[in-house]
Interface confidence: low
C-alpha cells in the first residue's frame, strides 16, 4: 500500500506566440481546480476508461479576476498535494491524466459552472520511494508544470511497496543481510528471499522463492517485457515464451490466505482478512503479542500478554491507526486563522501568516499602516490585511517612491498632445476640442459643449489637469 502524490507548480500560458486569453474576467471571476486519474501499465487508454489505480480532486484555488487587456499570467493554484492512495503493489509503470478545470463564479442560475480548460496525459515508469520527478506538459497554448512521486505507507517499503518492515529484534542492528527500513530507521526489512535471479526492478515476492512480475513484465524471472500486440486476454500469469498475458486463475483461486483467513479480490491482486491472532499479507504471521513490538512510531503496547489476547497500541502525538502506523495530518484541523498557511514540521506545527496578521496561529490583526511610510507626501490606506499608499500627484508605486509619468496613459483625447508638468499634466488640444483632457468638442458657432470656458482661457489653449 502507498500513496501517489502530485504537486502542481504552475499553470499558465506556454512559451511562444499565441498566448491564451485568461479564462477569468472581471465579469466572470473564476478559480481553478485539478483532477488526476491514474491507470496501471503503459496502455494508451481512452480518457473515459476507469482510473484503475485511483483518482483525486484538488481543492479549489483562490478566486481570480483578470485585469482587462492583460495577457494571461500563471494562474493562482490550490494549496497542497493531490494524493491518490493505492492498496496493492505499486505497478512501476503507469499512465496519468491531469485535467485543469475552471469553476466560474458569476451569477449562474443553479450555482457555479465548471468547464475543462486543459487535459494532459502521459505514460511513465516510476519506482516507489524515489525522489520527486518533475514534468512539464503542454495542452494547446497552456503549460502545466508539476512533480510527482509514489511513496509506500508503513509497514510497506521497496520500489513496489511489497517488502515489509518489522520492529528490530535487537536494539542496535538488523539481522544478517537485512537493511534498516528507511525512513523508519528503528525497523528492519522483513527477511524475504525471492527466487534467485528474480529481477529487482520488475519482480517481487511475497513468499520466499517466489518471483511475481510487475505489470508490463513477464517470464520466470520477470525479465521479459510484455508485448500486447498479439495478446487477447488481459488477465493471468505471464507466458515466458510468447511474452503475452494468457488466461489464468484468479488471485483468490486456491485461497492464498493461511490460518483461516478469507480472501477477496482487488483490482490487481488479493487481500486477506485474518482471524484474531494472525496478521501479514497472507495471515502467515501468528501470535502477535506486545513482546513482538507491533506498535510503530514509538507507540506504547498494552495488553496482549499471550497470543490469544488482543493488544492495544497507545499512539504518540502525531500518529494514529491500530498500530500507530498512520501519520496524523494535523493541518486538517485548520489551526491557522485568517487564511494562514499551515505547515506540519514534524516536531511542531507552524502557521505562515498572510500579510497583516501575526501570532502563532495568525490570530492577531496588525495595524496595517503601523511603521509603514509612504514617500513623497503619500498617505497610507489600511485594508484587507495589507497597506496601500495613496500617492500624491506625480508619484506612484507601492510606497510612492517612483516618479510617475502622467502622460503614459495617453490622457489627452482627440489627438491632444500631453506635456508632463511638476503639478500633473497639461493637454494641448487639437483644433476643435477643449477641456482638461480635450474631451469636449467646440461647436462650429464658437459655443462649446461646456457651459462656459474658464475666464481668460480660449478653446484650443493648453489646459492644465490638476
Amino acid at each position: 500500500a502507498g500513496v501517489f502524490e502530485l504537486q502542481i507548480h504552475s499553470f499558465g500560458p506556454g512559451p511562444g506566440p499565441g498566448a491564451p486569453r485568461s479564462p477569468c474576467s472581471a465579469r466572470l471571476p473564476c478559480r481553478l481546480f485539478f483532477r488526476v486519474c491514474l491507470k496501471p501499465g503503459l496502455s494508451e487508454e481512452a480518457a473515459e476508461s476507469p482510473c484503475a489505480l485511483g483518482a483525486a480532486l484538488s481543492a479549489r484555488g483562490p478566486v481570480y479576476t483578470e485585469q482587462p487587456g492583460a495577457p494571461a499570467p500563471d494562474l493562482p493554484l490550490p494549496d497542497g498535494l493531490l494524493q491518490v492512495p493505492f492498496r496493492d503493489a505499486w505497478p512501476g509503470t503507469f499512465s496519468f491524466i491531469i485535467e485543469t478545470w475552471r469553476e466560474e463564479l458569476g451569477d449562474q442560475i443553479g450555482g457555479p459552472a465548471w468547464s475543462l480548460l486543459a487535459r494532459v496525459a502521459g505514460r511513465r515508469r516510476l519506482a516507489a520511494g524515489g525522489p520527486w520527478a518533475r514534468d512539464i506538459q503542454r495542452a494547446g497554448a497552456w503549460e502545466l508544470r508539476f512533480s510527482y512521486r509514489a511513496r509506500c505507507e508503513p509497514p510497506a517499503v521497496g520500489t513496489a511497496c511489497t517488502r515489509l518492515c518489522r520492529p528490530r529484534s535487537a536494539p542496535s542492528r538488523c539481522g544478517p543481510g537485512l537493511r534498516p527500513c528507511a525512513p523508519l530507521e528503528d525497523e528492519c526489512e522483513a527477511p524475504l528471499v525471492c527466487r534467485a535471479g528474480c529481477s529487482p526492478e520488475h519482480g517481487f515476492c511475497e513468499q520466499p522463492g517466489e518471483c511475481r512480475c510487475l505489470e508490463g513484465w513477464t517470464g520466470p524471472l520477470c525479465t521479459v517485457p510484455v508485448s500486447t500486440s498479439s495478446c487477447l486476454s488481459p488477465r493471468g500469469p505471464s507466458s515466458a515464451t510468447t511474452g503475452c498475458l494468457v488466461p489464468g486463475p484468479g488471485p483468490c483461486d486456491g485461497n492464498p490466505c493461511a490460518n483461516g483467513g478469507s480472501c477477496s479480490e482487488t483490482p490487481r491482486s488479493f487481500e486477506c482478512t485474518c482471524p484474531r491472532g494472525f496478521y501479514g499479507l497472507r495471515c502467515e504471521v501468528s501470535g502477535v503479542t506486545c513482546a513482538d513490538g507491533p506498535c510503530f512510531n514509538g507507540g506504547l503496547c498494552v495488553g496482549g500478554a499471550d497470543p490469544d489476547s488482543a493488544y492495544i497500541c497507545h499512539c504518540p502525538p502525531g500518529f494514529q491507526g491500530s498500530n500507530c502506523e498512520k501519520r496524523v495530518d494535523r493541518c486538517s484541523l485548520q489551526p491557522c486563522r485568517n487564511g494562514g498557511l499551515c505547515l506540519d514540521l514534524g516536531h511542531a506545527l507552524r502557521c505562515r501568516c498572510r500579510a497583516g496578521f501575526a501570532g502563532p496561529r495568525c490570530e492577531h490583526d496588525l495595524d496595517d499602516c503601523a511603521g509603514r511610510a509612504c514617500a513623497n507626501g503619500g498617505t497610507c490606506v489600511e485594508g484587507g490585511g495589507a497597506h496601500r499608499c495613496s500617492c500624491a500627484l506625480g508619484f506612484g508605486g507601492r510606497d510612492c517612491r517612483e516618479r510617475a509619468d502622467p502622460c503614459a496613459a495617453r490622457p489627452c483625447a482627440h489627438g491632444g498632445r500631453c506635456y508632463a508638468h511638476f503639478s500633473g499634466l497639461v493637454c494641448a488640444c487639437a483644433p476643435g476640442y477643449m477641456g482638461a483632457r480635450c474631451e469636449f468638442p467646440v461647436h462650429p458657432d464658437g459655443a462649446s459643449a461646456l457651459p462656459a470656458a474658464p475666464p481668460g482661457l480660449r478653446p484650443g489653449d493648453p489646459q492644465r489637469y490638476l
Partner: nanobody
Framework: EVQLVESGGGLVQPGGSLRLSCAAS????????MGWFRQAPGKEREGVAD???????SYADSVKGRFTISRDNSKNTLYLQMNSLRAEDTAVYYC??????????????????WGQGTLVTVSS
Amino acid sequence: EVQLVESGGGLVQPGGSLRLSCAASGDTYRSYCMGWFRQAPGKEREGVADIVSDGSTSYADSVKGRFTISRDNSKNTLYLQMNSLRAEDTAVYYCAVDRGGSGGYCYTGRYDYWGQGTLVTVSS
C-alpha cells in the same frame, strides 16, 4: 533538475561557530523556498531553519537565537551561521529546496531537491 552542494561542515568545540553554505545550480525557473535540515545518528531528520523567497525566516525552537539562515539570490547560495554550538547539534546537515506552487510559501516536508549533506561534529 536542481543540484545542491553543501560545504562548511567540520569538527568544532562546544561554544564554537561554523558557517554552512549551500550552492544551488540548474533549473531555477521559479523562486525557491530553501531550508536546512539535520539528522543525528539514530534519529529522524528534523527541520532546522527555512527562508522564503520574500526573505522571511523561521527556526526550530532548539536553535532559535543561535543559528541564522540567510540567502544570496545573486549567487544562488543559502547559508546557515551556527553560533554557540552544543554537542547535541552534531549531525549531518542537509540543504533542501522547495519550488512550491504559488505564493512563495515554504511547504515544509515537501522539499523536492536535497543536497548530499555535510557533517558537523561538536566535541571537545
